[in-house]
């Protein structure tokens, strides 16, 4: 069994206000079984942005079909970006259980928001 890695290839992305931001995340193994969640910020104050198993998350869409069992791409697109969306976003794998437990995190992608072009 290959050890799971979570790859967030972009250290940072810059998006103009009003546009969509794509945050990339791929995993290298299907094990352990459990969902992927996206958060903005680290630690106890972090904010849930997307959860495979919950919803809806009106501004968030997945780039690929995350319900397919063999899917390893958990990239997301966030629409209508505002300055309040700035921060570091983490793609985190949870291990299935009662409750699910945090297993591993990507290194994070910083989202920087530029002023809307006039």
């Amino acid at each position: 069994e290959e050890e799971l890695q979570i790859i967030q290839p972009d250290k940072s992305v810059s998006v103009a206000a009003g546009e969509s931001a794509i945050l990339h995340c791929t995993i290298t193994s299907l094990f352990p079984v459990g969902p992927i969640q996206w958060f903005r910020g680290a630690g106890p104050a972090r904010v849930l942005i997307y959860n495979q198993r919950q919803g809806p998350f009106p501004r968030v869409t997945t780039v690929s079909e995350t319900t397919k069992r063999e899917n390893m791409d958990f990239s997301i697109s966030i629409s209508n970006i505002t300055p309040a969306d700035a921060g570091t976003y983490y793609c985190i794998k949870f291990r299935k259980g009662s409750p699910d437990t945090e297993f591993k995190s990507g290194a994070g992608t910083e989202l920087s928001v530029r002023a809307k072009p006039s």
């Epitope: 290839p9 250290k11 940072s12 810059s14 680290a42 630690g43 106890p44 570091t88 591993k104 995190s105 290194a107 994070g108 910083e110 920087s112």
Partner: antibody, heavy 119, light 108 residues
């Protein structure tokens, strides 16, 4: 061989300005995010600022926000730090540091340049 | 902001002895942690990244371990050139990037 050479340090009075430079060689400068890290006398390391390879993304430590400006000239392979409204607590050795291509740790550092703010 | 606390502040050891340096994070940084060595008049040098991966050219007497909030840098047998100050740095919770306060390894 990667080389980072800082310059521009010196002695200034509180409230004055200084511009630091870091000349880079031995790698494709425009492809790497760059940082300034400082060390006050007898103290530990403190991250100051970072700039992405394109110059589009910039971050500052709260302690320097609004006073310091990081920039880069990729045609000259040079990183800059414009330091305004200097305070005594800005006295430190300022290091230029090259980031790893994947993560925000520093795989190469310069020798540093000393900035002294004193009346 | 993630605070890194290094211990001990100073380690007094003799050449040939084993050095164990600790770094504790105020919240989990997974394995996104680096170690640096600093000597007077020299540029800081990257030793370890991703908590346990040795940087290019670093001797194998240096090793890193840990994950989450507890990390260790071990120097298996101190050589004269290893007496220096060592810093940990986390690159998970950012900005800001944060460093520990340092551990000085001095000759006993």
């Amino acid at each position: 061989d990667v080389q980072l050479v800082e310059s521009g340090g010196g002695v200034v009075r509180p409230g004055e300005s200084l511009r630091l430079s870091c000349a880079a060689s031995g790698f494709t400068f425009s492809s790497y995010d760059m940082n300034w890290v400082r060390q006050a006398p007898g103290e530990g390391l403190e991250w100051v600022s970072l700039i992405s390879g394109s110059g589009e993304i910039i971050y500052y430590a709260d302690s320097v926000k609004g006073r310091f400006t990081i920039s880069r000239d990729n045609s000259k392979n040079t990183l800059y730090l414009q330091m305004n409204s200097l305070r005594a607590e800005d006295t430190a050795v300022y290091y230029c540091a090259k980031e790893n291509n994947r993560y925000r740790f520093f795989d190469y550092w310069g020798l540093g340049t000393l900035v002294t703010v004193s009346s | 902001e993630t605070v890194l606390t290094q211990s001990p502040g100073t380690l007094s050891l003799s050449p040939g002895e084993r050095a164990t340096l600790n770094c504790r994070a105020s919240q989990s940084v997974y394995t996104y942690l680096a170690w640096y060595q600093e000597k007077p008049g020299q540029a800081p040098r990257l030793l370890i990244y991703d908590a346990s991966s040795r940087a290019t050219g670093i001797p194998d007497r240096f090793s890193g371990s840990g994950s989450g909030t507890e990390f260790t840098l071990t120097i298996s047998s101190l050589e004269s050139e290893d007496f220096a100050v060592y810093y940990c740095q986390q690159y998970y919770d950012r900005p800001p990037l944060t460093f520990g306060g340092g551990t000085k390894v001095e000759i006993k």
